[in-house]
Amino acid sequence: GITQSPKYLFRKEGQNVTLSCEQNLNHDAMYWYRQDPGQGLRLIYYSQIVNDFQKGDIAEGYSVSREKKESFPLTVTSAQKNPTAFYLCASSI
C-alpha cells in the first residue's frame, strides 16, 4: 500500500516541516497534491523515476526528494506562507 505520515501536523512560524510518503507497490511515479477547503486537488510536485522530479502547479514554498523508489518526502518550507491545507500523496505505475 501507500502510507502518509503524520496524519496531523502543526508548524511553528518560520519552520520547515516534512511529510513522509512511502509505498511498497513498486510504482515508479509518485505525486504530492494540496487541497484547500472547498477546492479541488492541486499538484505540488511529481516524480516519475528515482532521483528525478518536476514541479507541479503550486511548487513554490515546497521541496521534495526522490532518493529511492519507495519514498517521496515533501518539505513545506518556511517560504510557504499559507501552509494550512490537506495534503495527499499518490503513486502510480
Epitope: D28, Q48, N51, D52, S65, E67, K68
Partner: antibody, heavy 120, light 112 residues
Framework: QVQLQESGPGLVKPSETLSLTCTVS?????????WNWIRQFPGKGLEWIGY???????NYNPSLKSRVTISRDTSKNQFSLKLSSVTAADTAVYYC?????????????WGQGTTVTVSS | DIQMTQSPSSLSASVGDRVTITCRSS???????????LHWYQQKPGKAPKLLIY???NRFSGVPSRFSGSGSGTDFTLTISSLQPEDFATYYC?????????FGQGTKLEIK
C-alpha cells in the same frame, strides 16, 4: 556533501581479476541513489560499467556483463568493482560516481579516479 | 547501444567567442516518462568530469549562465555564449535514458 574515494592496485596482470573499492562518506549508500563505476580509456573515451542501487540491485553494461560484478559492504559504506579476465584493453582510469540530487541519472559526485594498467 | 556522436571533435576559439557543440544520438532519448536524459560534462586534464547541464537544458548548481543546452529527440547542442579562459577543456554529452548509459567521444575546445 557526498565524497567518494577509489582504492585498489594500479597494476593487474592479463587474465587476472581487477578489484577496486569505493569508500563513500557524507551519505549512506543504503539511503538512496545509484552507485556507479565509469572508466576512461587512454584515448579519453568514457564508458559506463554499471551500478549498484541503494537496495543492492545491479545494472551492468551488457558489453561487460559476463566479466563484471559490483557489490557492496554496507557496514563500511563501500561498494566494489570486480572485472575478470582482463586484457590490455581494460587499461583505463576507473572512477566511482553517484548522481546529484534531482538530476535523473546524471552523475556529479566523482572519486578522484584510479589508473589501472593491465600488463605482464 | 545508443551511439552518441559529437561534432566537432576539436575546436579552436578565442576568449569572448560564441561556441556551439552538437551531439546526435542514434535513437530518440525521450524516456517513456516523456523526460529526456541528455547531459553535458566538462573535463579538464587530470580531473574527473564535471556536470554542466542535465536533462537537455537545466544548468547544474554553480554553472555560469553563459552555458546553455537545447535540443530534443536525437539532436542536442551545448552553447557557450562568451568563452572565458577557464572554459578551455573537453566537453562530453551523455545519455541516461537507455541502458547502457553512453557518452559522446568528446569535443576538445582549445585556445586559438
Amino acid at each position: 556533501q557526498v565524497q567518494l574515494q577509489e582504492s585498489g592496485p594500479g597494476l593487474v596482470k592479463p587474465s587476472e581479476t581487477l578489484s577496486l573499492t569505493c569508500t563513500v562518506s557524507g551519505y549512506s549508500i543504503t539511503s538512496g541513489y545509484f552507485w556507479n563505476w565509469i572508466r576512461q580509456f587512454p584515448g579519453k573515451g568514457l564508458e559506463w560499467i554499471g551500478y549498484i542501487s541503494y537496495d543492492g540491485s545491479n545494472n551492468y553494461n551488457p558489453s561487460l556483463k559476463s566479466r563484471v560484478t559490483i557489490s557492496r559492504d554496507t557496514s563500511k559504506n563501500q561498494f566494489s568493482l570486480k572485472l575478470s579476465s582482463v586484457t590490455a584493453a581494460d587499461t583505463a582510469v576507473y572512477y566511482c560516481a553517484s548522481p546529484s540530487p534531482g538530476t535523473g541519472y546524471a552523475v556529479d559526485y566523482w572519486g578522484q579516479g584510479t589508473t589501472v594498467t593491465v600488463s605482464s | 547501444d545508443i551511439q552518441m556522436t559529437q561534432s566537432p571533435s576539436s575546436l579552436s576559439a578565442s576568449v569572448g567567442d560564441r561556441v556551439t557543440i552538437t551531439c546526435r544520438s542514434s535513437q530518440s532519448l525521450v524516456h517513456s516518462n516523456k523526460n529526456t536524459y541528455l547531459h553535458w560534462y566538462q573535463q579538464k586534464p587530470g580531473k574527473a568530469p564535471k556536470l554542466l547541464i542535465y536533462k537537455v537544458s537545466n544548468r547544474f548548481s554553480g554553472v555560469p549562465s553563459r552555458f546553455s543546452g537545447s535540443g530534443s529527440g536525437t539532436d542536442f547542442t551545448l552553447t557557450i555564449s562568451s568563452l572565458q579562459p577557464e572554459d578551455f577543456a573537453t566537453y562530453y554529452c551523455s545519455q541516461s535514458t537507455h541502458v547502457p548509459f553512453t557518452f559522446g567521444q568528446g569535443t576538445k575546445l582549445e585556445i586559438k
